[in-house]
Interface confidence: medium
Amino acid sequence: NSLFNQEVQIPLTESYCGPCPKNWICYKNNCYQFFDESKNWYESQASCMSQNASLLKVYSKEDQDLLKLVKSYHWMGLVHIPTNGSWQWEDGSILSPNLLTIIEMQKGDCALYASSFKGYIENCSTPNTYICMQRTV
Amino acid sequence: NSLFNQEVQIPLTESYCGPCPKNWICYKNNCYQFFDESKNWYESQASCMSQNASLLKVYSKEDQDLLKLVKSYHWMGLVHIPTNGSWQWEDGSILSPNLLTIIEMQKGDCALYASSFKGYIENCSTPNTYICMQRTV
């Protein structure tokens, strides 16, 4: 138990969020970070993994409603599986219907997140900013 | 001390954020919430106050860098003081130079926050969405 050394007392009217990596955004007990540097999808994935996180997974419009106000385009963890035509998250789960509007803007097998729950298809080698996400237990 | 009844143990490698009102966004120990309903500036201010918060105050590009990615326009706590021509926050503090680019879009004494640290002057009676903020102690 040596990793745990802070005791925090929380008012009943409010709550703590997390835990998250330092200076990440915490919302509904998920952690998010927006990275400014442009990387291709694979580099972005590696960057998130190095921080014990993964590229953004959109799983709930309700739990992730902060995403509707995100400006610009950012890599998320959604990839196209040519063998069966589906869009899957990094963890292997299938994209749920009606969660994202997939827009066929470019030819590619990776997807950028854009505001209001849109996903833009993009070539995986194209550099873009990216969003990492860590689910708290 | 009766309000405090939760003890939380935090790993040293990560940290909790807050405390914040339930389901608010927590970032660098500030709490933020985006409200969808359109209200005029005064109603927006009252709504934030009723939640023990205030309209958004921009005080640091570094501590509030999540704001650069915010889409659309939202009331913040910045008002024009006609008697001396300055822009002040609700708490009476003067807007620091170089924090916001003030854009004179409309005639008015209130300001909307827009992405990349821009402030749009707007008539205070115009309904808009709004951002509430609560500084954690």
Epitope: H80, P82, T83, N84, G85, S86, W87, N98, T101, I102, I103, E104, M105, K107, G108, D109, S116, K118, I121 | -
Partner: antibody
């Protein structure tokens, strides 16, 4: 890259017909194949689509109501549309189409020449 | 289902004219909209995808604009080969739906 259609013709009300679309010049198994129809003098109407790969995932327009069935044969690079319980309202030119890229399913840049189906007694 | 309303249903124009066709969705589809051209007896041809992206090989006199629910196809200077029917199609979600079409005829 092309789509070659076959199988149209005259059929009696209540009858059945199979339309097929042979793909050439590209890897059929990595693309969606879509079917669209156009009644004489009318607009375009989406019928449904099927993925050419192992899963054969399908999606249909609600009005199809089980009367039409999409299938594909990966080895033959062929997609087929089985039409059943046909009525005069199904009289139309039927097109197969392919998206512009394998990860697309809703934007079509390659079309078959069309095959006419006439339902009449 | 998303409904697409196209207008006008037909128009008469002369070579060199600027022609505008509009398409309206009954709900927000962002920029997930395609435009097709169809000549008599032929299959449709993709002109514009993602509301404003010009398909490879399509002349630059064709342009698309709009986002959300309102979209426009513009032909800046009508050429003889442009007399055809034009259809919009939403690419936001299944089932896919097309507009009713606009027939561009010679005046």
């Amino acid at each position: 890259q092309q789509l070659e259609q076959s199988g149209g013709g005259l059929v009696k009300p209540g009858g059945s017909l199979e339309l097929c679309c042979i793909a050439s010049g590209f890897d059929f198994s990595t693309y969606w194949m879509t079917w669209v129809r156009q009644a004489p003098g009318k607009g375009l109407e989406w019928i449904g689509c099927i993925h050419g790969g192992g899963s054969g995932t399908t999606s249909y327009a609600s009005w199809v109501n089980g009367r039409f069935t999409l299938s594909r044969d990966i080895d033959q690079s062929t997609g087929c549309l089985q039409l059943t319980s046909l009525t005069a309202a199904d009289t139309a030119m039927y097109y197969c189409a392919r998206p512009g890229y394998r990860s697309w399913s809703k934007t079509f840049d390659l079309w078959g020449q069309g095959t006419m189906v006439t339902v009449s007694s | 289902d998303i409904q697409m309303t196209q207008s006008p249903s037909s128009l008469s124009a002369s070579v060199g004219d600027r022609v505008t066709i509009t398409c309206q969705a009954n709900q927000d589809i962002s920029n997930a909209l395609n435009w097709y051209q169809q000549k008599p007896g032929k299959a449709p041809k993709l002109l514009i995808y993602a509301a404003s992206s010009l398909q490879s090989g399509v002349p630059s006199r064709f342009s698309g604009s709009g986002s959300g629910t309102d979209f426009t196809l513009t032909i800046s200077s009508l050429q003889p080969e442009d007399f055809a029917a034009y259809y919009c199609q939403q690419a936001a979600s299944f089932p896919l739906t097309f507009g009713g079409g606009t027939k561009v005829e010679i005046k």
